[in-house]
């Protein structure tokens, strides 16, 4: 079994594992997440995504949290559970991300703009969030990116 | 309210180059896709460009690949165009365009500003 | 490369008319993923910039006037001026967005008797 999104395939990465370092996470992140009103990975974001779609979608969503979740969050942390923990999510999202490649096609036009969308719509709420709470809710919501993605896992 | 006020247009000679600049105000700037129109005198609307939010990824016309190039500042809300190798029939009025919002479905020009003229003759 | 065929190139009509005008794409310009006509139609005043009418083959830009609607599906679309008024009288131009380069029509002139 692989990741397949859309024509972009992922070998090497298990979503059990992925969900280990999670969970050892899970309760301390969504116990620091406040703001219950407000969701990052909003239905706009992920529902109804086409295969096509998934590949840059999940391109653009896992460069952000390597780029902007992960990076900001390790400055901010001590504990060395919680680094261990984000440490295996932010090496399996490079592994993710290195394999890869959505098409450059002129053709990809509207299908690569609808997922811009989509991730425009998730930046923007964590734009709108004070730096430390979207830090929080995003690294909170890393369940439902991967619930998200493992739609895409199959034989 | 939106305002997009281009800049840079000028008379330039036949392989010369020119940087047009627009700058943006009224709406959250990295928010949006960003792309330049232009308009030959006397003739319709031509696609030039196009920018992603973080310009990230470019799209250009045919006819103008490799030699113009689409970048933006978001710290500063600009947006550019590079044009280099420039020819007499790049004269026209040049348009930046603001993308629609990101939570429409589908894009297109929702905003303009008012233009710039590049004339290129010798 | 997507053309849009316009026709027809010019059109003169009294106050109050309908106007109808085409677009005919060279393929198909209705996204798989969602459905979504990605479709739009522009007005151009003389020495103005051009402003946005329609997105998405039928949906009224907001501001818009109400006699100003869109229609069509596929690779045949269509603007119709339901009562033309004399501020009317522009250039109209149809745009696909579909996939690059994007591209517009050549542009119907309408102009007011």
């Known amino acids: 079994q692989e990741f397949h999104f859309g024509p972009c395939q992922v070998k090497g990465v298990v979503p059990q594992k992925l969900w280990e370092a999670f969970w050892a996470v899970k309760d301390t992140m969504q116990a620091q997440d406040n703001i219950t009103s407000a969701r990052l990975l909003q239905q706009e974001v992920l529902q109804n995504v086409s295969d096509a779609e998934s590949c840059y979608l999940v391109h653009t969503l896992l460069e952000f949290y390597l780029k902007t979740v992960f990076k900001n969050y390790h400055n901010r942390t001590v504990e060395v559970r919680t680094l261990k923990s984000f440490s295996t999510l932010a090496n399996n999202f490079v592994l993710i991300v290195s394999q890869l490649q959505p098409s450059q096609e002129n053709e990809m036009f509207s299908i690569r703009d609808s997922a811009h969308r989509r991730f425009l719509l998730f930046r923007r709420a964590f734009k709108q969030l004070d730096v430390e709470a979207a830090l929080t809710k995003a690294l909170g919501e890393v369940d439902i990116l991967l619930t998200w993605m493992q739609k895409f896992y199959k034989l | 309210e939106v305002q997009l006020v281009e800049s840079g247009g000028g008379l330039v000679q036949p392989g010369g180059s020119l940087r047009l600049s627009c700058v943006a105000s009224g709406f959250t700037f990295d928010d949006y896709g960003m792309s330049w129109v232009r308009q030959a005198p006397g003739k319709g609307l031509e696609w030039v460009s196009f920018i992603t939010w973080n310009g990230g990824i470019t799209y250009y016309a045919e006819s103008m690949k490799g030699r113009f190039t689409i970048s933006r500042d978001n710290a500063k809300n600009t947006l550019y165009l590079q044009m280099d190798s420039l020819k007499s029939e790049d004269t026209a009025v040049y348009y930046c365009a603001k993308d629609s919002d990101p939570s429409i479905a589908t894009p297109y020009f929702g905003s303009w500003g008012q233009g710039t003229q590049v004339t290129v003759s010798s | 490369e997507i053309v849009l065929t316009q026709s027809p190139s010019s059109v003169t009509a009294s106050v109050g008319e309908k106007v109808t005008i085409n677009c005919k794409s060279s393929?198909?310009?209705?996204?798989?993923?969602?459905?979504?006509?990605?479709l739009n139609w522009y007005q151009q005043r003389p020495g103005q910039s051009p402003r946005l009418l329609i997105y998405?083959?039928?949906t009224q830009e907001s501001g818009i006037p109400d006699r100003f609607s869109g229609s069509g599906s596929t690779t045949d679309f269509t603007l119709t001026i339901s009562s033309v008024q004399p501020e009317d009288a522009a250039v109209y131009y149809c745009q696909q967005a579909y996939s690059a380069p994007l591209s517009f029509g050549s542009g119907t002139r309408l102009e007011i008797k």
């Open positions: 998405s083959a039928s």
């Open positions: 393929q198909s310009v209705v996204s798989g993923s969602n459905q979504k006509s990605y």
